[in-house]
């Protein structure tokens, strides 16, 4: 195909791929009609003047995973048709000024995973058609004002995984078309008021894994189109009352791994489209009434691994669409009988690793669609008669690691469990803790007469059997997997996956997967 270098493969579709450690310079001659050129995993260390001069029809150029550390300013001369240029995963520390001059058609520029120490306004001043700029995984410590001023058409900017300690409030001011801004894994401690004011079309803002301690009250007030806001793994101890007030399109908010002690009233709202709220790994100690009442479409609420010891009876008011509620690994001892009554669509509740000593008999009275209940590792000695009777869809119930008291009062529960054994799972069954003579024996097969020989055991009505449908999939809802799992985080690494499957790690988690960011 018009002379393909021996180190490369060339396809009919005008695609050229050159790979291998033997390659130490750009192979020649390259086919004049090449439209896509990939130079991958070579030992090329520099690009000299005009190595691509004879392939002016080139549209995509990937020079990735090489030893590239030096580029001559005229390296990309004569590539006026180039739309996609990737120099990712090389060893570039410096970009020569004017390197991208003449690349008038360039839309995507990937400079990620290099060792760039700085960028200057002159670097990108010629790239007026650029839509995507990837700078993540470099060593940038600051972004000078004006660096992006000419990139008015930019829709995606990734500055994640750098060493940024502060951001100028003016650096993004001309990026009115930006839809995605990623600043994750930097060293930002605060973000000045006004930093995001010009980003009126922003849909995703990733600020996770920084050291942000305080959010300015009006920080997001101009970002009315924001859909995904990632604030996890920072040092946020307080949320200003109005900080999320102007975000009507938001559908995912992550705040896990911060230092939140309380959720101020009205903090979440109105957010009519929010579907997921991730709050685990904070220091929240109580949930007042109506704290989530503006989140009418919320489906996933993760409050695990906090210090919650009190939930007000109206804390979950308004959450009529909630499917998954994670409260595991907290300090709950009591639950008011009305606390879950609004959660008519709840499918999965995790309450494991708390200090619950008893449950109200009507705790699940309105929650008819429950499919999975995690109650393991609490202080439960018995459960009220009929607590699960109406839960016809229940297919997963975890009761192990509780100090079950196997006296005559346990009979109704024992009988119900006997009839509904498949729901308990096969890994760990509940065992008796007392009396001493039956400690360690399975609650399901225990002979209660043996446990308390001196007590006459009356005929106790058993828990009526709820039908068990072995053919019913546990989670027909596509956003769920086994309820004993919970991702460490909603996926924020921007892979192309739409669903992440996770494996069971009961000691830490207790919910479902999420979908990729």
């Amino acid at each position: 195909y018009h002379g393909c270098p021996s180190e490369c493969t060339c396809s009919r579709a005008s695609q050229v791929e050159c790979t291998g450690a033997r390659i130490v310079a750009v192979p020649t001659p390259l086919p004049w009609n090449a439209m896509s050129l990939q130079i991958l995993n070579t030992h090329i260390t520099e690009l000299n003047e005009s190595p691509f001069l004879n392939i002016s029809a080139l549209i995509a150029l990937r020079i990735e995973k090489n030893e590239l550390s030096r580029i001559t300013p005229g390296a990309f001369r004569n590539l006026g048709s180039l739309r996609y240029l990737s120099l990712a995963n090389n060893k570039l520390q410096v970009l020569p000024i004017g390197l991208f001059q003449g690349l008038d058609s360039l839309e995507s520029l990937l400079l990620s995973s290099n060792q760039l120490l700085q960028i200057q306004p002159a670097h990108f001043s010629q790239c007026s058609n650029l839509k995507e700029l990837q700078l993540h995984g470099n060593h940038l410590e600051y972004i000078p004002d004006g660096a992006f001023d000419h990139l008015v058409g930019l829709t995606k900017l990734n500055l994640g995984k750098n060493s940024l300690t502060h951001i100028s409030p003016r650096v993004f001011q001309h990026l009115g078309n930006l839809q995605v801004l990623r600043l994750y894994e930097n060293r930002l401690t605060d973000i000045p008021m006004g930093t995001f004011d010009g980003l009126v079309n922003l849909q995703e803002l990733a600020l996770q894994q920084n050291q942000i301690g305080l959010l300015s009250p009006g920080l997001f007030h101009n970002n009315h189109n924001l859909q995904r806001l990632y604030l996890s793994n920072n040092h946020i101890s307080q949320l200003p009352p109005s900080v999320f007030m102007q975000l009507p399109q938001l559908n995912r908010l992550t705040l896990f791994g911060n230092s939140l002690k309380e959720l101020s009233p009205g903090i979440f709202g109105p957010m009519p489209n929010l579907r997921e709220l991730w709050l685990y790994d904070n220091h929240i100690s109580s949930l007042p009434d109506n704290v989530f009442s503006n989140l009418r479409q919320l489906q996933v609420l993760i409050l695990s691994r906090n210090q919650i010891s009190f939930i007000s009876p109206g804390a979950f008011n308004g959450l009529t669409e909630l499917r998954e509620l994670s409260l595991h690994t907290n300090a709950l001892q009591d639950l008011d009988g009305n606390v879950f009554r609004m959660l008519a669509n709840l499918q999965n509740i995790s309450l494991q690793n708390n200090r619950l000593r008893q449950l109200p008999g009507n705790i699940f009275a309105n929650v008819n669609g429950l499919m999975a209940i995690q109650l393991q590792n609490n202080q439960l000695e018995n459960l009220p008669l009929g607590i699960f009777d109406h839960l016809g869809k229940l297919c997963e119930l975890r009761l192990y690691d509780n100090p079950w008291r196997c006296d005559s009062d346990i009979l109704p529960l024992r009988n119900w469990l006997l009839l509904n054994q498949p729901r308990l799972g096969t890994d760990t069954v509940p065992v008796c803790f007392s009396p001493a003579n039956v400690r360690g024996q399975s609650l399901i097969i225990i002979n209660v007469n043996v446990a308390v020989p001196s007590v006459h055991v009356p005929e106790v009505p058993s828990y009526p059997e709820t039908p068990w449908y072995p053919d019913t999939p546990s989670y027909p809802d596509t956003t769920s997997v086994s309820s004993t799992t919970e991702l460490t985080s909603p996926v924020e690494d921007y892979t192309d996956l739409t669903t992440i499957q996770v494996t069971d790690d009961r000691s830490v988690w207790g919910m479902t997967q999420a979908q990729s960011g």
Partner: antibody, heavy 118, light 107 residues
Amino acid sequence: QVQLVQSGAEVKKPGASVKVSCKASGYTFTDYYINWVRQAPGQGLEWMGWIYPGSGNTKYAQKFQGRVTMTVDTSTSTVYMELSSLRSEDTAVYYCARWGYGAYFTYWGQGTLVTVSS
Amino acid sequence: DIQMTQSPSSLSASVGDRVTITCKASQNVGINVAWYQQKPGKAPKLLIYSASYRSSGVPSRFSGSGSGTDFTLTISSLQPEDFATYYCQQYNSFPYTFGGGTKVEIK
């Protein structure tokens, strides 16, 4: 229907203790928090704390910490509020009250007048 | 502690009058405010919860509004049985606190 019936009026001397009872009926006693609220003559209402009958867990207002004790007897569906080291300012009507679908007081006892006088 | 400042402390009105009582919280309490009516020698009675929701059996002439720090109880057309003392209460954070009360008297 939910009913909270309190014990009768008490007269106590300063320094003494008083124990007021509140008997609940019409619902599952152990499943809902019960609060105590007091009202001095001609004055407003003051929240004292709550007890969860199912576990006996309590939370007291800082002002009463160390002087108030709330207890429960599940066999009789009764909660008790004991206030010690009484002083004249403790003269008030003491109410037990139960939350409804939120932490507001939907159900009230009839009140118990405690008079502290030498 | 959150202070609930109620005003006026008393008012005189006639049957049929529109009466407005306000309550100001010393900090944001969201919508976690209730209003009670109390008649002499009786326990308080819940009128409004979550700032604006009428308790069951409460006549529609009673309405509540507000959020954050400023709240209002309105009686659209005062009836003879409405002469009583009214209290607001915040239940957003412990200790739960009440306003000082507003006594509604016959003019």
